[in-house]
């Protein structure tokens, strides 16, 4: 449970009524859209001996609900209908027979905003705690995914990029990951909270955007992070090149990495010819690849693709299902809006591709 979602507990004390009746719950909780929160809650109500054999049922209702007419948003009573819009998302996680009325909310939605009250029933003992009530505030999703690039991106060398949302919660609907990149890519493994993209960069992929988009379908909210690829040709010992960018979009180079140009016109001409050949082959192969799905279980090929707006063509790879519930959170993360990994070619100029073709790889 992300700690920031559990606000400092503003406990409302025992009711000012009778020491026999009380409910303790924080009066206000804030949760970001698409995320989840567990609200601790305890209550007490005197149970007469004559109700001892009856099961204890707990209910959370929206403020203003009429018990006899309106369904609760959550209950532990199996045959009780609950509000359609909260079904499966609001759960009475606490055990009312142990005086626990804790409420779990997952895939928080804007319309969850409002106040809620708890009700307990045990045989003929039935009581609605109209005070204190729980006020739920659903705010914008400000968290964004982290993208981990281990080491340096080199042309022709495959690297595993990890997009993670370690701040998301286990209990919610697993998010849908979408990757958007011009570079040749394929999908790697995913967990509940992360997705791996296998990228094999080409020289011309330097400076292009790579976007990881994460959609929380349970709440219909999306968040993304975009980085700029730095494809570095390093013949010597490779060094990690991950730098936060300033968002200006300017290409940066690391001082002391660019070495002298390769001498000789003949060598230059030969190199230019080789580069042209390689570029043509790669481009043709890329077009073919764009017609065949790289992803697994291509079940939603018509789903709309992600930005950037300048993309000419997009390629969707169908969602991959996961039943895993363990989220691996990468330790190296990229925090800025736009990132650059330093791109330096030893003795060559990367050709500019004016009609970059972006490929979107979507996982679920």
């Amino acid at each position: 449970m992300p700690l920031l979602l559990l606000l400092p507990l503003l406990w409302a004390g025992a009711l000012a009524m009778d020491p026999n009746f009380w409910l303790q719950v924080q009066e206000s909780v804030t949760v970001q859209e698409g995320l989840c929160v567990l609200v601790p809650c305890t209550f007490f109500h005197p149970i007469p001996y004559y109700d001892k054999n009856s099961p204890v049922h707990g209910y959370w209702f929206r403020e203003g609900a009429i018990i006899s007419r309106d369904s609760p948003v959550a209950t532990n009573k199996l045959d009780q209908e609950v509000q359609e819009e909260t079904q499966g998302r609001f759960r009475l996680l606490g055990d009312p027979s142990r005086n626990n009325c804790s409420l779990s909310i997952v895939d928080a939605r804007r319309r969850d905003n409002g106040s809620y009250f708890f009700r307990m029933e045990r045989g003929s003992t039935k009581y609605s705690y109209k005070s204190p009530q729980l006020s739920v505030h659903v705010t914008d999703l400000t968290h964004r995914p982290k993208i981990l690039i281990p080491g340096t991106l080199e042309p022709g060398h495959s690297k595993n990029l990890t997009c993670s949302v370690s701040w998301a919660c286990e209990q919610g609907t697993p998010p849908i990951f979408s990757w958007l990149s011009a570079a040749p890519t394929s999908l790697g493994p995913r967990t509940t909270h992360s997705s791996v993209l296998i990228i094999t960069p080409r020289p011309q992929d330097h400076g292009t955007n790579l976007t990881c988009q994460v959609k929380f379908a349970g709440a219909g909210v999306t968040t993304e992070r975009t980085i700029q690829l730095n494809v570095t040709y390093v013949p010597q010992n490779p060094t990690t090149g991950i730098f936060p960018g300033d968002g200006s979009g300017k290409q940066e180079t690391r001082a002391g990495v660019v070495h002298g140009a390769i001498g000789g016109a003949g060598v230059t001409a030969l190199l230019a010819l080789c580069l042209c050949l390689i570029f043509f082959i790669v481009k043709t192969h890329r077009r073919k690849a764009a017609r065949t799905a790289v992803g697994r279980n291509d079940t939603h090929p018509t789903t709309g693709s992600a930005s950037p707006k300048h993309q000419k063509k997009s390629k969707l790879h169908g969602p991959t299902e996961t039943s895993s519930c363990s989220g691996a959170a990468p330790t190296v993360e990229m925090d800025e809006e736009l990132h650059y990994a330093s791109l330096n070619f030893h003795g060559m100029n990367p050709s500019k591709d004016t009609s970059t073709e972006y490929s979107e790889v979507r996982t679920q």
Epitope: D18, F21, I47, Y49, Y50, I67, S124, S128
Partner: antibody, heavy 127, light 107 residues
């Protein structure tokens, strides 16, 4: 001081309905359950049912199920008992009683007592 | 339903006498028993709760005892103001049930 004041005597014809009120004062209305008990002339006490102060479906004695309805009005701290399809067997004094629950055992179960009663309402069913 | 039986339905005693009023439950009620006193034309009043606990304001000549299914209300020294009908009531289970009552009169 705690008081339960009931409505006045009623005379009804068989098949009719009667509604008896019980107005509470001197305590926090929403903290106590209210029961209804009746007593036919020269007979013992018969429990009719219980209503929660915060609403929801009351619990009724099985033999009265379908004929008795208990409601409450928070704004006036009043509990009502309505009995329909009256017969001569329903001629009785009807009492409302406040239930107090005393500190209980380690399981949280509590003793139950009727610590305050209304003065009673005589309902006579006669053709 | 738990049946509560009070026998005899009435008894006569002299002022100052020790009076015992029995009550029997049809099953074990775990001491979950109250005693009420009802005077003619009045509502019942709580005397004893939980088998043996004296309600506040009730004279100490009243006491209760028993366990399981057999219970007794005792008036150690009968007074004229004790003329009333006495009811036992169980709260072990719903429906709550009362005994038929025992009417106490002065000889």
């Amino acid at each position: 001081q705690v008081q339960l004041v009931q409505s006045g005597a009623e005379v009804k014809k068989p098949g009719a309905s009667v509604r008896v009120s019980c107005k509470a004062s001197g305590y926090i209305f929403t903290n106590y359950y209210v029961h209804w008990v009746r007593q036919a002339p020269g007979q013992g006490l018969e429990w009719m049912g219980i209503i929660s102060p915060s609403g929801g479906s009351p619990t009724y004695a099985q033999r009265l199920q379908g004929r008795v309805t208990m409601t409450r009005d928070l704004s006036t701290s009043t509990v009502y008992m309505e009995l329909s399809s009256l017969t001569s067997e329903d001629t009785a004094v009807y009492f409302c009683a406040r239930e107090s629950r005393l500190r209980g055992n380690r399981l949280g179960l509590q003793s139950s007592i009727f610590d305050h009663w209304g003065q009673g309402t005589l309902v006579t069913v006669s053709s | 339903d738990i049946r509560m039986t009070q026998s005899p339905p009435s008894l006569s005693a002299s002022v100052g006498d020790r009076v015992t009023i029995p009550c029997q439950a049809s099953q074990d009620i775990n001491n979950h028993l109250n005693w009420y006193q009802q005077k003619p034309g009045k509502a019942p009043q709580l005397l004893i709760y939980d088998t043996s606990n004296l309600e506040i304001g009730v004279p100490s000549r009243f006491s209760g005892s028993g366990s399981g299914t057999d219970f007794t209300l005792t008036i150690s020294s009968l007074q004229p103001e004790d003329i009333a009908t006495y009811y036992c009531q169980q709260y072990e289970n719903l429906p709550l049930t009362f005994g038929g009552g025992t009417k106490v009169e002065i000889k």
